[in-house]
Amino acid sequence: GVFNYETETTSVIPAARLFKAFILDGDNLFPKVAPQAISSVENIEGNGGPGTIKKISFPEGLPFKYVKDRVDEVDHTNFKYNYAVIEGGPIGDTLEKISNEIKIVATPDGGSILKISNKYHTKGDHEVKAEQVKASKEMGETLLRAVESYLLAHSDAYNEQKLISEEDLGGEQKLISEEDLHHHHHH
């Protein structure tokens, strides 16, 4: 069956900057700013666009070893990211996959709202455990706050727009800051 859920959280970081850091460069940032939550992110296939498969590994002591995410859409115009958790972590006997959408919306005060929608695909009539929803929410919050702190401490990061060539990005253009160049890797 299916269970639909959504949650909202706010950030003091402007939408465009947060999208660049949290979504477009999360693979690099997460292990760096939140090593207690994520130990590594590895691209298994694809270049970051739809169809890309990423393996996110968790440090020892956490309930799960890893998850695999499949990127379904990256919308640079509307600051929207769609991906599905397809393997590892909670995926198994009772849960088939989790489809997630993160939409970052600008607020009048210069900050942003993150609207996170989750669609849990369960096997048969299995119910989604409340703890699973809570754990997923907490992980997202941990990563967001870690990225937010990093951005507040590094005011130049993911800010000044400089266009990297298509060749550097494996055929995909995107705006990136001066400092991002140091962290940039091929997707």
Epitope: G1, V2, F3, Y5, N82, K119
Partner: antibody, heavy 122, light 108 residues
Framework: QVQLVESGGGVVQPGRSLRLSCAAS????????IHWVRQAPGKGLEWVAV????????YYGDSVKGRFTISRDNSKTMVYLHMNSLRTEDTAVYYC???????????????WGQGTLVTVSS | EIVLTQSPGTLPLSPGERATLSCRAS???????LAWYQQKPDQAPRLLIY???SRATGIPDRFSGSESGTDFTLTISRLEPEDFAVYYC?????????FGQGTKVEIK
């Protein structure tokens, strides 16, 4: 404007099969889940099935599970409902409906077709 | 499955009057995932409200939705002649997606 047009309804004997079609236009079809909802004569609405935007995920109401199959062809902007082992209680107007939210969907229905009547009778 | 119970079954009112339709859920509807539809005879249903209180495109502001716990309400502030129809609520938090049995708003 968004348009959904169902076809394929008719009179069929119990135990037989029928295939309903839903032709969609006026929106980016490949970005939306499509549902089938039915209404027995003089009765309320009953959700029947859904197919995800990419065709990977399909879910069914308990009363049709194992008998009905939903499919789609994004290149033709068509959705189909294959109905096998039909029963008299399947008699209803069948509507196809567009999900109100793109990609993964939210499972409410913002546009509906005019419906096609399926009568299962011996 | 989540059962939705609508009341009253029939609501006889006159044009210009206020209509209050109720929909009660058998369990919690997280994120206000409830929609309202209007259906006129020999027509397809039409979406009025989603998210318990957000009006769908083109729906006049005399239609409004609200919620309190597991109780949801559709209010039509001043009934127009074209508002006499059957109204259904629908939950979309947990599959199977279910509808209430409907409330018929008829001319008194």
């Amino acid at each position: 404007q968004v348009q959904l047009v169902e076809s394929g309804g008719g009179v069929v004997q119990p135990g037989r099969s029928l295939r309903l079609s839903c032709a969609a236009s006026g929106f980016t079809f490949s970005r939306y889940a499509i549902h089938w909802v039915r209404q027995a004569p003089g009765k309320g609405l009953e959700w029947v099935a859904v197919i995800s935007y990419d065709g990977d995920d399909k879910y069914y109401g308990d009363s049709v599970k194992g008998r009905f199959t939903i499919s789609r062809d994004n290149s033709k902007t068509m959705v189909y409902l294959h109905m096998n082992s039909l029963r008299t209680e399947d008699t209803a107007v069948y509507y196809c409906a567009k999900d109100g939210y793109s990609l993964y969907g939210k499972d409410y229905f913002d546009y509906w077709g005019q419906g096609t009547l399926v009568t299962v009778s011996s | 499955e989540i059962v939705l119970t609508q009341s009253p079954g029939t609501l006889p009112l006159s044009p210009g009057e206020r209509a209050t339709l109720s929909c009660r859920a058998s369990q919690s509807i997280t994120n206000s995932y409830l929609a309202w539809y209007q259906q006129k005879p020999d027509q397809a249903p039409r979406l009025l409200i989603y998210g318990a209180s957000s009006r769908a495109t083109g729906i006049p502001d005399r239609f409004s939705g609200s919620e309190s716990g597991t109780d949801f309400t559709l209010t039509i502030s001043r009934l127009e002649p074209e508002d006499f129809a059957v109204y259904y609520c629908q939950q979309y938090v947990r599959s199977p997606w279910t509808f209430g049995q409907g409330t018929k708003v008829e001319i008194k």
